[in-house]
Amino acid sequence: MAVTACQGLGFVVSLIGIAGIIAATCMDQWSTQDLYNNPVTAVFNYQGLWRSCVRESSGFTECRGYFTLLGLPAMLQAVRALMIVGIVLGAIGLLVSIFALKCIRIGSMEDSAKANMTLTSGIMFIVSGLCAIAGVSVFANMLVTNFWMSTANMYTGMGGMVQTVQTRYTFGAALFVGWVAGGLTLIGGVMMCIACRGLAPEETNYKAVSYHASGHSVAYKPGGFKASTGFGSNTKNKKIYDGGARTEDEVQSYPSKHDYV
């Protein structure tokens, strides 16, 4: 029962984590304009992995996609790759783990096969979570580097009385979503790996002992009953609830206004 619970919980946690990774990847707020040095700006800039946006105080938001592939920084490409790999691995892991769930019966699938599938999906979730955490961390590091570089150059280009304040970017909401989601996927993967140990048929070192009764010769093998009858398995169709992670990229600050590209 504890194994089923651990496996089921691992699946749900990973599902939420992967939904979060997808949400973070799609979000536009990976980096947002730092307003510390310019709190009176009427124009707010923010950037995602796929496009950059400008929200005016009038409520209008303009987003422009990065239509170049070669012109983008290598780090951004690397972050994109890490996030996509994380999503793909996570999606495959989810697919595998559905069939590995102890509460779902598929033909006469052996427990050993389910254990292997659970381990496979667990490893996939762990790698998926690590990819997401790595991707978000690389982007965060890039932001920190650029932040301090632009701080150092803050007032270069000051000519006479004219001030040119350089736009600095700080951590956006997507980074925190990505870190949390990656962590959840990682935890879910670890739970699946733990569940795998409990699912695997226990091979004992005891030799099969023959008991001779009068007129009958029956051999009992330890663990045989459990293996043959499917004892302890949950045969009910257990519903997995997906909370439905929603992406709040806030491309638009006012619902009644239209975005234009």
């Epitope: 304009q33 310019n38 009176v40 700006t41 009427a42 124009v43 800039n45 950059s52 946006c53 400008v54 005016e56 105080s57 009038s58 409520g59 209008f60 303009e62 422009r64 004219v162 001030q163 040119t164 304040v165 350089q166 736009t167 006012y254 619902p255 009644s256 206004k257």
Partner: antibody
Framework: EFQLQQSGPELEKPGASVRISCKTS????????MNWVKQSNGESLEWIGY????????RYNQKFKGKATLTVDKSSSTAYMQLKSLTSEDSAVYYC???????????WGQGTTLTVSS | DIVMTQSPSSLTVTAGEKVTMSCKSS????????????LTWYQQKPGQPPKLLIY???TRESGVPDRFTGSGSGTDFTLTISSVQAEDLAVYYC?????????FGSGTKLEIK
């Protein structure tokens, strides 16, 4: 057609308060910020502040904080500006204007003349 | 606050002439995020409210005659009327739309001979 219809001219005594209205029609009132602008005796323009009719959020020019209060009535698609503790300095033409792309003001009311005199 | 300085304060021209007026801001109005300048030009005729002519420094508002052209970037901006008409008699204001509080220039009064 878009319209911003402002209330008529006002004559007030110093120290009094006044409320100017700006009734809109022809567009989604909650979809656009409403700005208020002051023009003293045909001189230059001064931005007072704006209100977001959807959320009710406001942003004021520091100079007019405590002097002007911006409100809206969504049901009648009307924006209001209340001016308190009036002095002769407040005598001016006040305009309401709708926010547009680039934070520009695309539609303006006809203006409300406020005269503060004892 | 960003200070907007307009010049000349007034100018008198004959119909058909080309006119340019200047607007300078104390800070750059260029937004790096979309490479747009948050400067607006308005026309105010006597006894009327201001009318939007140009936003984003160079984008002409719909219905505005193409003789009106906005140009410039950063801190220096220009409004050009290629061939002045009698109906262009007005005061022209530039406005900072980049930083709070939104500030207006003192205006350029255009008079026709």
């Amino acid at each position: 057609e878009f319209q911003l219809q402002q209330s008529g001219p006002e004559l007030e005594k110093p120290g009094a308060s006044v409320r100017i209205s700006c009734k809109t029609s022809g567009y989604s009132f909650t979809g656009y910020n409403m700005n208020w602008v002051k023009q003293s005796n045909g001189e230059s323009l001064e931005w007072i502040g704006y209100i977001d009719p959807y959320y009710g959020g406001t942003r004021y020019n520091q100079k007019f904080k405590g002097k002007a209060t911006l409100t809206v009535d969504k049901s009648s698609s009307t924006a209001y500006m209340q001016l308190k503790s009036l002095t002769s300095e407040d005598s001016a033409v006040y305009y309401c204007a709708r926010s547009y792309y680039g934070n520009a003001f695309d539609y303006w009311g006809q203006g409300t003349t406020l005269t503060v005199s004892s | 606050d960003i200070v907007m300085t307009q010049s000349p304060s007034s100018l008198t021209v004959t119909a058909g002439e080309k006119v340019t007026m200047s607007c300078k801001s104390s800070q750059s109005l260029l937004n790096s995020g979309n490479q747009k300048n948050y400067l607006t030009w308005y026309q105010q005729k006597p006894g009327q409210p201001p009318k939007l002519l140009i936003y984003w420094a160079s984008t002409r508002e719909s219905g505005v005659p193409d003789r009106f052209t906005g140009s410039g970037s950063g801190t220096d901006f220009t409004l050009t009327i290629s061939s002045v008409q009698a109906e262009d008699l007005a005061v022209y204001y530039c406005q900072n739309d980049y930083s709070y509080p939104f500030t207006f220039g003192s205006g350029t009064k255009l008079e026709i001979k």
